[in-house]
């Protein structure tokens, strides 16, 4: 988790002098509770936006927006703590809006936005906005939270972001797999425009089961420049096991931008359809 560009972040708006500060996610009001605290944010909304860095890179960011309730507690509102928690790693990043002037009611509802938290493809986040100071112990909560999931690099709009392109999202191998005679699979895919090696991972399964009955790895050396964007054809020999008929072929590239953590592509061959054969009728009837 990080902030997009560490240029001056702005939270001031007409009628409010405000500054954005790094936060430890542990506001002082936890330790030194105040008697009078503001009410919670209203209408918290989290959206996925895309933003360019000063270097021209494109990143997905969490666009956070909320409004204030129209009650007298805004007189005690000193700022807000914005927290983003990545759910699978428990990593948290916070910033603090520090109000340098007192808020007053005006003809429009106060609205705040922040779009500088960079988020990762295929990750889920909990976004919380806490009004400051935080409430006394047992006081009514004055925060609002929402979870949101970022699409993965297969998504059309995500595909062109810098983190996705770095992991090889623009490569479309267009994998085809066909079953040949004599327990063989023919795998064909399009090479990318980089002199890097590939690995084909074959995993076979019995019909309708998820534990593998055969695994095989095949190394493909780095292509020469004249082979870029050409089709690579590989024939894999299968283990002669009856019923080990569903094959998943996964191609792992080793591009320089992502090394051994590049996006993998896969294709699956289903088991052949079994004709419905009627149960044979016994020509004698057992007596027991």
């Amino acid at each position: 988790l990080r902030l997009l560009d560490h240029r001056a972040l702005v939270c001031s708006q007409p009628g409010l002098n405000c500054t954005v500060k790094n936060s430890t996610c542990l506001d002082d009001s936890w330790i030194h509770p105040r008697n009078l605290t503001p009410s919670s944010p209203k209408d918290l909304q989290i959206q996925l936006h895309f933003a360019h860095t000063q270097q021209g890179d494109l990143f997905p960011v969490a666009h956070i927006e909320w409004t204030l309730q129209t009650d007298a507690s805004i007189l005690y509102l000193e700022g807000a703590e914005l927290s983003v928690l990545q759910l699978n790693t428990n990593e948290r990043l916070c910033v603090r809006f520090e109000f340098l002037s007192k808020l007053r009611h005006h003809h429009r509802r106060w609205r705040f936005t922040f779009s500088h938290f960079v988020v990762d493809p295929d990750q889920e986040y909990e976004v919380t906005v806490h009004h400051l100071p935080k409430p006394i112990p047992d006081g009514d909560p004055n925060h609002q939270s929402k979870n949101f999931l970022v699409p993965d690099c297969e998504h059309a709009r995500m595909k062109v972001t810098t983190p996705c392109m770095s992991s090889g999202s623009l490569w479309d191998p267009n994998i085809t797999v066909e079953t040949l005679e004599a327990h063989q699979l023919r795998v064909s895919f399009t090479l990318w425009n980089e002199s890097t090696h590939y690995q084909i991972l074959l995993t076979s399964f019995p019909h309708m089961e998820n534990h593998s009955c055969f695994e095989h790895m095949h190394h493909i050396p780095a292509p020469r420049p004249e082979e870029f964007h050409q089709r690579s054809n590989v024939t894999l020999t299968l283990r002669n096991l009856k019923g080990c008929c569903r094959h998943q072929v996964q191609i792992q590239p080793f591009f320089s931008s992502c090394l051994n953590d590049c996006l993998r592509h896969s294709a699956t061959v289903s088991c052949p359809e079994m004709p419905d054969t009627p149960e044979p009728i016994p020509d004698y009837m057992p007596l027991w």
């Epitope: 989290i46 936006h49 889920e124 609002q144 929402k146 949101f148 999931l149 970022v150 699409p151 998504h155």
Partner: nanobody, 127 residues
Framework: QVQLVESGGGLVQPGRSLRLSCAAS????????MHWVRQAPGKSLEWVSG????????DYADSVKGRFTISRDNAKNSLYLQMNSLRAEDTALYYC????????????????????WGQGTMVTVSS
């Protein structure tokens, strides 16, 4: 123009099944997460289920978990809700809704994250 049209509602006996459909047009359907929301007579809106753009993530309200299944067919620009073991308390107007942005609201009150709603299809569960 951007439009969502629900169908498949009707009168059904308790314990029976129904399949709702939602046809989308006017936007790139497979870019967005979609949701089902319902409103029982005299009650407020209740989120029912959500599905991410590629069906990789599906979520359900506790009240329908194990009975309802959400699915989508991006090739047909369609969203579905398979409702099994229907109960009287499932009686409501069912709406499909599109998320405003490309993310997927996976918890918290999500209704304000939707920008396009259908006109709804009525489901009545009664013997």
């Amino acid at each position: 123009q951007v439009q969502l049209v629900e169908s498949g509602g009707g009168l059904v006996q308790p314990g029976r099944s129904l399949r709702l459909s939602c046809a989308a047009s006017g936007f790139t359907f497979d870019d967005y997460a979609m949701h089902w929301v319902r409103q029982a007579p005299g009650k407020s809106l209740e989120w029912v289920s959500g599905i991410s753009w590629n069906s990789g993530r599906k979520d359900y309200a506790d009240s329908v978990k194990g009975r309802f299944t959400i699915s989508r067919d991006n090739a047909k620009n369609s969203l579905y809700l398979q409702m099994n073991s229907l109960r009287a308390e499932d009686t409501a107007l069912y709406y499909c809704a599109k998320e405003k942005s490309l993310g997927y609201c996976s918890s918290g009150p999500c209704s304000d994250a939707f920008d396009i709603w259908g006109q709804g299809t009525m489901v009545t569960v009664s013997s």
